[in-house]
Interface confidence: low
Amino acid sequence: AQEVQQSPHCTTVPVGASVNITCSTSGGLRGIYLRQLGPQPQDIIYYEDGVVPTTDRRFRGRIDFSGSQDNLTITMHRLQLSDTGTYTCQAITEVNVYGSGTLVLVTEEQSQGWHRCSDAPPRASALPAPPTGSALPDPQTASALPDPPAASALP
């Protein structure tokens, strides 16, 4: 059966830093999503070989891709406290398949010790709460910021 290998399981990074998430499959998929889990899951990117990747407006200008849809590395730049959360890869196949998830903990530089990653894969039902004031954005407002000019906006 098709599986999605996802790494890392967890990473703690300071505000402004970058993180790599890798989604690997055995092939035979149509495309791959990266989804941020939470009370209201949000699709972050969609990647399909031969097609311009699409990125949620909250992350536009902060996402890079390398590799192919079978072995895709997604780099999220200039991380903000509100980016804290679990991100899971979803492979679009005849039956959609999910990765184990990556818990991204974005912390203030002086508070690196607040949350540390364990070796266990993250579970959406057992996530540590993000630091006060950095809860995941309300989906009703997360995309309400102006977008870059049309000439530079991704499709």
Epitope: P41, Y46, E48, A150
Partner: antibody
Framework: EVQLVESGGGLVQPGGSLRLSCAAS????????MSWVRQAPGKGLEWVSA????????YYADSVKGRFTISRDNSKNTLYLQMNSLRAEDTAVYYC????????????????WGQGTLVTVSS | QSALTQPPSASGSPGQSVTISCTGT?????????VSWYQQHPGKAPKLMIY???KRPSGVPDRFSGSKSGNTASLTVSGLQADDEADYYC??????????FGGGTKLTVL
Amino acid sequence: EVQLVESGGGLVQPGGSLRLSCAASGFTFSSYAMSWVRQAPGKGLEWVSAISGSGGSTYYADSVKGRFTISRDNSKNTLYLQMNSLRAEDTAVYYCAKDPDPGYFDWVAGDYWGQGTLVTVSS
Amino acid sequence: QSALTQPPSASGSPGQSVTISCTGTSSDVGGYNYVSWYQQHPGKAPKLMIYEVRKRPSGVPDRFSGSKSGNTASLTVSGLQADDEADYYCSSYAGSNNLGFGGGTKLTVL
């Protein structure tokens, strides 16, 4: 060839429910966001709801929030709109439409539309 | 009441150009590059003509072009043809996960 075929419309009393379906073919359904747009008789277009390709993100117009639910079954290439607590002002032709680019709903109603299904809310 | 304001009618002779405006605010048209234009013939489903201000879907002739200045978006139809006679609607992202439409403009080819 891209085809979208809506069904499920009809006459319903105020306060009632209906479930609209939109059968899609001719494209990789799971890769595209989908929308519902309605048009009251003799009136203009009104966006109702949208859903991303995986179904992970949903969006609703204020006028239907809490009453309508959009969903999709990518294994059946079908889009749905569950409409509850219907009101007379919900009377319209309901169109489903496909986003022009794969991935996210990028705030465009769609490049391919079905022919619509009429919903009439009346006692 | 429509979120976006369009003139109720516009007209032009075959071969001429006509421009239809779509006026909003800094919270919709002026704040985002998610303006689309749709053509609808009587009794038919709408057809997307322009999206993201100026992008044309495949199959839409380059006689149709979109632009935006401040809080007003415009659709220009050049080299008017009889089949261009239809209703035209604009839409724009309006913030807070809402998509607003204009009231529509009836284009008449004289």
